[in-house]
């Protein structure tokens, strides 16, 4: 069942997106689930539908309930449900758990706190940010686009952060607040000279002529967030893009973080329709970062067709 929880505070704007996605050209109809009554699209209404979005301008406690959205295309209909809860404003500073968005964690190198759901709204900078209800002041805090950056993060920076912004709809302004917890990871990240896990040095890879082949270059660079780390393939000492053979392409694999915390990168070299001349090339897996560069070389060899038993 495609259902999504949404929540907001009374007298604030709340915009909810249909959990079922479709092309912008598809029509989306919204209904009150209990009554099956259609939600109007006219903007003069306090609650109205606008394509994939359901807008409460502003929200009231009585708006709480389940809303149905149906995405209609020429060939299919998709149904989703938005479970909306509107809460009364708290008189004290504490933000209850049910109003909290997902917790984010940061470290000395990476301390961005994104304002939750803000991309649904028509807002203009700057955002206002609060920590435990206190407005954030000082040069360490920088409101940038839709996120807060904290310089020189310390363990004391952990806490509940609230972003406040104004949504504008046809000239009318509505306030929106959203809160999430921020935790500080006490991780001492470090960077190492690259270590290539695959391929092995001077590896011979067996391939079949006419078939496709994949080579994976995988390397680790240290622990935590890595600055300027990359893996790539070269052919005969030339970058893939400069080599000019459209059959041979590289694409980024997964950024990996293993259970031991090592930060690793993959790059897959895809060779379509392997040809004889591919066996003459030297394939270099390069891993590089600020410390230096390491190279492992692979060559291809022809795989003998498997002899079938009759």
């Amino acid at each position: 069942k495609f259902s999504k929880q949404s929540w907001g505070l009374e007298n604030e704007a709340l915009i909810v997106r249909c959990p079922r996605q479709g092309k912008p050209s598809y029509t989306v109809d919204w209904y009150y689930s209990q009554t099956n009554k259609s939600i109007p699209t006219q903007e003069r209404n306090r609650v109205f539908a606008s394509g994939q979005l359901l807008k409460f301008l502003p929200a009231a406690v009585a708006d709480s309930g389940i809303y149905t959205c149906i995405v209609r295309s020429p060939t299919f209909n998709r149904t989703g449900y938005a479970n909306v809860t509107i809460y009364k404003k708290q008189s004290d500073c504490n933000v209850p758990d049910y109003l909290m968005y997902s917790t984010v964690s940061g470290s000395e190198k990476n301390s961005k706190i994104y304002c939750p759901t803000i991309d649904l709204y028509n807002w203009t900078a700057p955002l206002e940010w609060f920590k435990n209800c206190q407005a954030l002041q000082g040069s360490r805090y920088r409101a940038h686009k839709s996120f807060l950056v904290i310089d020189n993060v310390m363990t004391e920076d952990a806490g509940d952060y609230t972003c406040k912004f104004i949504h504008n709809e046809n000239g009318a302004n509505y306030s929106v607040t959203a809160t999430r917890s921020f935790t500080v990871k006490d991780e001492q990240g470090f960077s190492l000279f690259p270590v290539i896990g695959a391929p092995a040095q001077n590896e011979i890879k067996e391939v079949e002529i006419g078939k496709n082949a994949n080579l994976t270059c995988s390397a680790c660079f240290g622990k935590g967030t890595q600055f300027l780390a990359a893996v790539l393939w070269q052919l005969n000492g030339t970058k893939i893009t400069d080599f000019g053979e459209p059959r041979i392409q590289q694409e980024e694999g997964q950024n990996q973080s293993f259970s031991n915390g090592l930060a690793c990168l993959d790059m897959v070299l895809r060779i379509a329709d392997v040809k004889e001349e591919d066996l003459l090339l030297q394939y270099d897996c390069l891993a590089l970062n600020l410390h230096g560069l390491r190279r492992h070389t692979v060559r291809l060899s022809r795989k003998n067709p498997s002899k079938e038993c009759f």
Epitope: G237, H291, R295
Partner: nanobody, 118 residues
Framework: ESGGGSVQAGGSLRLSCAAS????????MGWFRQAPGKEREGVAA????????YYADSVKGRFTISQDNAKNTVYLQMNSLKPEDTAMYYC????????????????WGQGTQVTVSS
């Protein structure tokens, strides 16, 4: 290696180092230096076509490493020289690693002396 010598502070020198026996397939060449009574330190390194270069913080902005693939030669242009740049400069080469750590290099030159007086 060649190009070493004596120079006044603020002057320039250009060191060169030729490697033989390497093909198109990629080589890293680096410059290292060792002053009397001090440990060897990496100065600069370059991989094949100069796309990847590494410099020690102490020489950034003053030294430039470059390569002539056709001649398999690496150059170190040293500008704004300081007395603390005085050392024996060694050229090193390796096929599979590049950077400022000397223990990764398999091939070493004999060295050329650079002396900078104030």
């Amino acid at each position: 290696e060649s190009g070493g010598g004596s120079v006044q502070a603020g002057g320039s020198l250009r060191l060169s180092c030729a490697a033989s026996g390497y093909t198109y397939s990629g080589i890293c060449m680096g410059w290292f230096r060792q002053a009397p009574g001090k440990e060897r330190e990496g100065v600069a390194a370059i991989y094949t076509n100069g796309e990847y270069t590494y410099y020690a913080d102490s020489v950034k902005g003053r030294f430039t490493i470059s390569q002539d693939n056709a001649k398999n030669t690496v150059y170190l242009q040293m500008n704004s020289l300081k007395p603390e740049d005085t050392a024996m400069y060694y050229c090193a080469a390796d096929r599979n690693t590049c950077g400022l750590r000397g223990d990764f290099y398999n091939y070493w030159g004999q060295g050329t002396q650079v002396t900078v007086s104030s």
